[in-house]
Interface confidence: low
């Protein structure tokens, strides 16, 4: 339904508040690098335009496309040119093209410092003198970081910030009461910020399509009850809201999830048993809450899928009247009969399922030709049932650190020409599948692991997109959206690398280390283990595990010693000597 | 001065009909989400309906959906809840509320009415 004036309709639909928390949030993902002075300057300046717009919707500019004018804004910003380069170029161009060029000079890993946590009473302090700015700030801080944050959710997150700040800070122990729940929040919130980058890069490189079959494969896992045309709706419809919020169209994006949610919750009888607790929430609550929603039962006595879809005459008339919605259907059959399988491996499956057709619909016996289709899926659900299964006992025998090393290692070994930040953070976070998803049953193993190291894998894509360095990584991030995994799992190592030069600077360690947090100092660990394996690629597990317990040992010592810092630098001499020597370097 | 004023209480029969009235003064209307609350006698309050600030988002609490209808008029700065099949657990104190964050449904409102008593009894 076409409005006068599309900012005085998204203002009236969404409110204030949320009107200048979003309009915040897509300014701050444009121009990362502005003060947040300035962008609060530019909010309340669009703010104030919205309220003319509502009180007459045929004032100067207010049928203008919102991002006409959120672009005109964000173009008068002075200091675009030093601050930004050839971003400044944008504004020369004329909308559509204008925002689709801010789009691509978003920064997935923006120099910026790390965000330091204040004292707990300096926080509090911060919150009680102007809680209003104070959230804003937080708003902020988050979107600049992470320009791809899901916005209606990072308002979900701020809400549970002001409630964190709310409660512990008038309470006995603010400190107890407080960190832990900033850190299950910061936790929770670069997940939910990895999550939605798959969901536009899957948009963004792969196309809508793609999004679709994903969208698909998981709402019929999530709800297994609902018919084809409820899950190909609630699909239509998610996939508007996010190529919304990818797009930067924010306000659209919120207010359509809103609409999005309201629907499910009026007919909840018809999609999923496991909705009822969501739907009495408040809005943003109800929002995360489906979005996370556990799967609903799967309907007794379903039949056999291979009845339509390989055993029926009718299979390639079925197929050639209307191919995306027979493999749609395909997708919504087999994925509701399988919770227990990866999303990604559906739809390698599907992706198997339409390649065979498309052959054997063209041959001179179809049904001869795609009777033995099932026989394929056999090896394709097996190789991550298989790799999740290893790597779940190597997980056990390890813990999680150690895990993470091995990992280091491994994809040292593939790609050693990535950066090692990049490597060290990658691989942490593949790491970290051990703890998320081994401790499950069978049955949700896989659709745990899989589907989070596509997330991981994706981070690596995004990051390795910003300054390509190897043509493996490429390969494997831009082929195919679901074999992204099984591309870098079968990787071997990279022969054709060149070993680093040996730096004894990049293994020299000062007493700064013996006040780190346990995760920082693994980190230092970590980078270096990263950087002994691109000086020596062929070095094998043992020699590396020996120098790596040296160095732990060597950190341990120092970090006991009266003398600390002179520690370092005579033991550290001695190891890099020894390390050297171990590894033949 | 922000004030909100609710109206069209009484008693009435098991299965009667009732409409209640808030009008609200001293602010931009327009720009607000609005909620109607009840207390019954000796409970807890219970949050019963939300409608955003141009009508465009409405929600209900399980245990009054498919029987009371929450609507505003901008242009009289009014809010309504329509109330049908009203049955004996009805019986409340009614209060209109603003949301203060003018979205995102917090249910932690600034603003209250005096309320207006709903009896439902044969």
């Known amino acids: 339904d076409a409005h006068k004036s599309e900012v005085a309709h998204r203002f009236k639909d969404l409110g204030e508040e949320n009107f200048k928390a979003l309009v915040l949030i897509a300014f701050a993902q444009y121009l990362q690098q502005c003060p947040f002075e300035d962008h609060v300057k530019l909010v309340n300046e669009v703010t104030e335009f919205a309220k003319t717009c509502v009180a007459d919707e045929s004032a100067e500019n207010c049928d203008k496309s919102l991002h006409t004018l959120f672009g005109d804004k964000l173009c008068t910003v002075a200091t675009l040119r030093e601050t930004y380069g050839e971003m400044a170029d944008c504004c020369a161009k004329q909308e559509p093209e204008r925002n689709e060029c801010f789009l691509q000079h978003k920064d997935d890993n923006p120099n910026l410092p790390r965000l330091v946590r204040p004292e707990v009473d300096v926080m509090c302090t911060a919150f009680h003198d102007n809680e209003e700015t104070f959230l804003k700030k937080y708003l902020y801080e988050i979107a600049r970081r992470h320009p791809y944050f899901y916005a209606p959710e990072l308002l979900f997150f701020a809400k549970r910030y002001k409630a964190a700040f709310t409660e512990c800070c008038q309470a006995a122990d603010k400190a107890a009461c407080l960190l832990p729940k900033l850190d299950e929040l910061r936790d929770e919130g670069k997940a939910s910020s990895a999550k939605q980058r798959l969901k536009c890069a899957s948009l963004q490189k792969f196309g809508e399509r793609a999004f679709k079959a994903w969208a698909v494969a998981r709402l019929s896992q999530r709800f297994p009850k609902a018919e084809f045309a409820e899950v190909s709706k609630l699909v239509t419809d998610l996939t508007k809201v996010h190529t919304e919020c990818c797009h930067g169209d924010l306000l659209e994006c919120a207010d359509d999830r809103a609409d999005l949610a309201k629907y499910i919750c009026e007919n909840q009888d018809s999609i999923s048993s496991k909705l009822k607790e969501c739907c009495e929430k408040p809005l943003l609550e109800k929002s995360h809450c489906i979005a996370e929603v556990e799967n609903d039962e799967m309907p007794a006595d379903l039949p056999s899928l291979a009845a339509d879809f390989v055993e029926s005459k009718d299979v390639c008339k079925n197929y050639a009247e209307a191919k995306d919605v027979f493999l749609g259907m395909f997708l919504y059959e087999y994925a509701r009969r399988h919770p227990d399988y990866s999303v990604v491996l559906l739809l390698r499956l599907a992706k198997t399922y339409e390649t065979t057709l498309e052959k054997c619909c063209a041959a001179a016996d179809p049904h001869e030709c795609y009777a033995k289709v099932f026989d394929e899926f056999k090896p394709l659900v097996e190789e991550p049932q298989n790799l999740i299964k290893q790597n779940c006992e190597l997980f056990e025998q390890l813990g999680e650190y150690k895990f993470q090393n091995a990992l280091l290692v491994r994809y040292t070994k593939k790609v050693p020409q990535v950066s090692t930040p990049t490597l060290v953070e990658v691989s942490r976070n593949l790491g970290k599948v051990g703890s998320k998803c081994c401790k499950h049953p069978e049955a949700k193993r896989m659709p745990c692991a899989e589907d989070y190291l596509s997330v991981v894998l994706n981070q690596l894509c995004v990051l390795h997109e910003k300054t390509p360095v190897s043509d493996r990584v490429t390969k494997c991030c831009t082929e195919s959206l679901v074999n992204r995994r099984p591309c870098f799992s079968a990787l071997e190592v990279d022969e054709t690398y060149v070993p680093k030069e040996f730096n004894a600077e990049t293994f020299t360690f000062h007493a700064d280390i013996c006040t780190l947090s346990e995760k920082e100092r693994q980190i230092k660990k970590q980078t270096a283990l990263v950087e002994l394996v691109k000086h020596k690629p062929k070095a094998t597990k043992e020699q590396l595990k020996a120098v790596m317990d040296d160095f732990a040992a060597f950190v341990e010592k120092c970090c006991k010693a009266d003398d600390k810092e002179t520690c370092f630098a005579e033991e550290g001499k001695k190891l890099v000597a020894a390390s050297q020597a171990a590894l033949g370097l | 001065e922000v004030q909100l004023v609710e109206s069209g209480g009484g008693l009435v029969k098991p299965g009667g009909s009732l409409r209640l009235s808030c009008a609200a003064s001293g602010f931009t209307f327009s720009n607000y989400n609005m909620n109607w609350v009840r207390q019954a006698p000796g409970k807890g309050l219970e949050w019963v309906s939300s409608i955003s600030s141009a009508g465009t988002h409405i929600y209900y609490a399980d245990s009054v959906k498919g029987r009371f209808t929450i609507s505003r008029d901008n242009a009289k700065n009014s809010l309504y809840l329509q109330m049908n099949s009203l049955r004996a657990e009805d019986t409340a104190v009614y209060y209109c509320?603003?949301?203060?964050?003018?979205?995102?449904?917090?249910?932690?409102?600034?603003?209250w009415g005096q309320g207006t008593l709903v009896t439902v009894s044969s």
């Open positions: 509320a603003r949301d203060p964050h003018s979205t995102g449904w917090y249910k932690d409102f600034d603003y």
